[in-house]
């Protein structure tokens, strides 16, 4: 779970150790603040839960790519 260290900055201290199917993911944001101990990706899931993930993992990169494509494709 991400932790808010103040109103503006949210950090991740632990990463999920289990891959989540992209079907269960709604969006993501990157955490790159120097105030945080590590770079991270926070996925927002279909049930509105935020989950910290390691941006170095392939499934995380693939999921971000997939979500990027989804947002670029206009819904008809």
């Amino acid at each position: 779970q991400p932790d808010a260290i103040n109103a503006a900055v949210t950090c991740c201290y632990n990463f999920t150790n289990r891959k989540i199917s992209v079907q269960r993911l709604a969006s993501y944001r990157r955490i790159t603040s120097s105030k945080c101990p590590k770079e991270a990706v926070i996925f927002k899931t279909i049930v509105a839960k935020e989950i910290c993930a390691d941006p170095k993992q392939k499934w995380v990169q693939d999921s971000m790519d997939h979500l990027d494509k989804q947002t670029q494709t206009p819904k008809t």
Epitope: K19, V47, A48, K49
Partner: antibody, heavy 119, light 109 residues
Framework: QVQLVQSGAEVKKPGSSVKVSCKAS????????TSWVRQAPGQGLEWMGG????????NYAQKFQGRVTITADESTSTAYMELSSLRSEDTAVYYC????????????WGQGTLVTVSS | EIVLTQSPATLSLSPGERATLSCRAS???????LAWYQQKPGQAPRLLIY???DRAEGVPARFSGSGSGTDFTLTISSLEPEDFAVYYC??????????FGQGTKVEIK
Amino acid sequence: QVQLVQSGAEVKKPGSSVKVSCKASGGTFSHYGTSWVRQAPGQGLEWMGGIIHIFGTANYAQKFQGRVTITADESTSTAYMELSSLRSEDTAVYYCARYDAHYGELDFWGQGTLVTVSS
Amino acid sequence: EIVLTQSPATLSLSPGERATLSCRASQHVSDAYLAWYQQKPGQAPRLLIYDASDRAEGVPARFSGSGSGTDFTLTISSLEPEDFAVYYCHQYIHLHSFTFGQGTKVEIK
């Protein structure tokens, strides 16, 4: 430890309806779902449908579409399964089972409710 | 709908022997979202394996899962008397459409 406790056995007449409840305790309810699985005597497991509690909308196996209604009450951490137009082939043990909506495996199961349909 | 076909229907083995159960899917099971359950007479099913190969909490190490795509296997390395039961595979790719295999009964020879 998560526990799912189901309502008791039922004997029903053909054409009637049955409503089975499943009360969860010992864990969070919101980002989880409840699946309903039935097992006719001597047969395998058959998925009937499920509901993700935070959404409140259910999905059903095609076979049961129009005859089954699955609901959940977050305030009491209880899920319900109602099956209508009962026939003798609906005689079975009905199980509720919990799943994390981020994944899907059924990690905790109720004890089962025997529904007997007989005239 | 993804159809899961388990084989064999019945496996007759002695305690101490190795059991190999197969589950074949009619379509690719993405993310290896496949589980195995054990069911004993008069009891609810119990989760053994999730994500094709991860053991659930409290499950003995003699149970292992493997496979990906359309072919999955549950192996019991050395059967204990309490392992004689029915085993089911289950796919959970789509939250709106779960399916189970028809089961494999592991019985004492």
